[in-house]
């Protein structure tokens, strides 16, 4: 029978910007029954707060309401893991909101082929960004990456499609079936999880030849 | 404890590349950006680039673009900056650093000495 | 790019007397968010640079209250209360604001 070993923050997630979840990985547990306790404090305090909601986020986790979320400062924090015979910390973590948003996926996804007398066919592709997404404030830059494959095909083919809610696709199989998804990310943020797939079915007369 | 291992020094000809690694320890690998940052002799520091090993999402400075490349390797918990078309001007410490969740640098690697030279 | 300007160039102060150092930015530092990403690193002799202060005034971790950080706006300062031996070094503004990051020319602190 051990004091518990190191915990470790490992993860920071915010929608949004208005609320966000830490999760912790314990240490070994020596043992025996192990209690977790995060602890915090923000920029230019010293009074140290304990996790307001240890529930939300599942195990391992704090949750910090929109109540308990500033963009204006950052995080201190720490994991304390403790049993009979002692304790450990984790070492200290510092979050910054902005730099830990993972959006909800794109909304909206609609493809089209469009065949223009004149020019090549191409498949156009647009999508809305998530709701919970202010992009109005200005210091919210998402991008965009699309892919889509043939229904019946292992590999997908990916486009990077910067800031645009739109994109247009030259180079595709006639007379196959294609899904096709969107996901964006803030600049310094992660990527958001794929939108529900949208299938299209190309025309056998889709020509790819100039 | 949070540890950042770089490559040994390194000589090279003018038009050639190079290739440093960066190994982390004593945290998850995936979980927080890594930079380069580079220090010619008696100079000032200079921000090459930056990537997040989760899914090496990159950000370069435009100086180096085309001229860097910075990856990871989650299976060995290393990154690597690769600058191309070596001149003499290039000759410089070269550091890695790590960020928290925040867009400023807490741990250094030790640096690695290039020196571009024919 | 945003240019950072130090000065001064280098500093030679007595133990136990008090240093500042100024930086000055191109253009406001102020994020659309509202932060200012503007930090201070010390790079010892022969050593990597390290974190003194983020976010213009916050000490990192283990950094003595010697140190601190003020400023707003383009202009910024970093005071030593009082100058100890082990201060020695090069001391760099940073901001990183605006992509990509940038550094100040650096001020070389020395002990008289």
């Known amino acids: 029978q051990l004091p518990p070993g190191k915990p470790e923050i490992f993860k920071c997630r915010s929608p949004n910007k208005e609320t966000f979840t830490c999760w912790w990985r314990p240490g070994t547990d020596g043992g025996l029954p192990t209690n977790y306790s995060l602890t915090y404090h923000r920029e230019g305090e010293t009074l140290m707060h304990e996790c307001p909601d240890y529930i939300t986020g599942g195990p391992n986790s704090c949750h910090f309401g929109k109540q308990y979320t500033s963009m204006w400062r950052t995080y201190i924090m720490m994991v304390n893991a403790t049993n009979q015979m002692g304790s450990s910390f984790s070492d200290e973590l510092y979050v910054d909101v902005t730099y830990i948003v993972q959006p909800d996926p794109p909304l909206e996804l609609a493809v089209e082929v469009k065949q223009p007398e004149d020019r090549k066919p191409y498949l156009w592709i647009k999508w809305s960004p998530p709701t919970l997404i202010d992009l109005k404030t200005g210091w919210f830059t998402l991008l965009y990456e699309i892919r889509l494959k043939p229904e019946k095909a292992a590999e997908w083919e990916i486009h990077f499609a910067g800031q645009q809610t739109e994109f247009k696709i030259l180079s595709l199989h006639p007379g196959q079936k294609y899904l096709v998804q969107v996901r964006c990310k803030p600049d310094h943020g992660y990527w958001s999880a794929w939108s529900p797939a949208t299938f299209i079915q190309i025309p056998s007369d889709f020509t790819m030849n100039d | 404890q949070v540890q950042l291992v770089q490559s040994g020094a390194e000589v090279k000809k003018p038009g050639s590349s190079v290739k440093v690694s960066c190994k982390a320890s004593?945290?998850?690998?995936?979980?927080?950006?890594i930079h380069w940052v580079r220090q010619a002799p008696g100079q000032g520091l200079e921000w090459m680039g930056e990537?997040?090993?989760?899914?090496?999402?990159?950000n370069y400075n435009q100086k180096f673009k085309g001229r860097v490349t910075i990856t990871a390797d989650k299976s060995t918990s290393t990154a690597y900056m690769e600058l191309s078309s070596l001149r003499s001007e290039d000759t410089a410490v070269y550091y890695c650093?790590?960020?928290?969740?925040?867009?400023?640098?807490?741990?250094w690697g030790q640096g690695t000495l290039v020196t571009v030279s024919s | 790019d945003i240019v950072m300007t130090q000065t001064p160039l280098s500093l030679s102060v007595t133990p136990g007397q008090p240093a500042s150092i100024s930086c000055r930015s191109s253009?406001?530092?102020?994020?659309?968010?509202?932060?200012?990403?503007l930090h201070w690193y010390l790079q010892k002799p022969g050593q990597s640079p390290q974190l003194l202060i983020y976010?213009?005034?916050n000490r990192f971790s283990g950094v003595p209250d010697r140190f601190s950080g003020s400023g707003s706006g383009t202009d910024f300062t970093l005071k030593i209360s009082r100058v100890e031996a082990e201060d020695v070094g090069v001391y760099y503004c940073?901001?990183?604001?605006?992509?990509?990051?940038?550094f100040g020319g650096g001020t070389k602190v020395e002990i008289k």
């Open positions: 650093a790590r960020s928290f969740f925040t867009n400023w640098f807490a741990y």
């Open positions: 940073s901001q990183s604001t605006h992509v990509p990051f940038t």
């Open positions: 253009q406001s530092l102020v994020h659309s968010n509202g932060n200012t990403y």
């Open positions: 990537i997040d090993p989760s899914d090496s999402y990159t």
């Open positions: 976010k213009v005034s």
């Open positions: 004593g945290y998850t690998f995936t979980s927080y950006w």
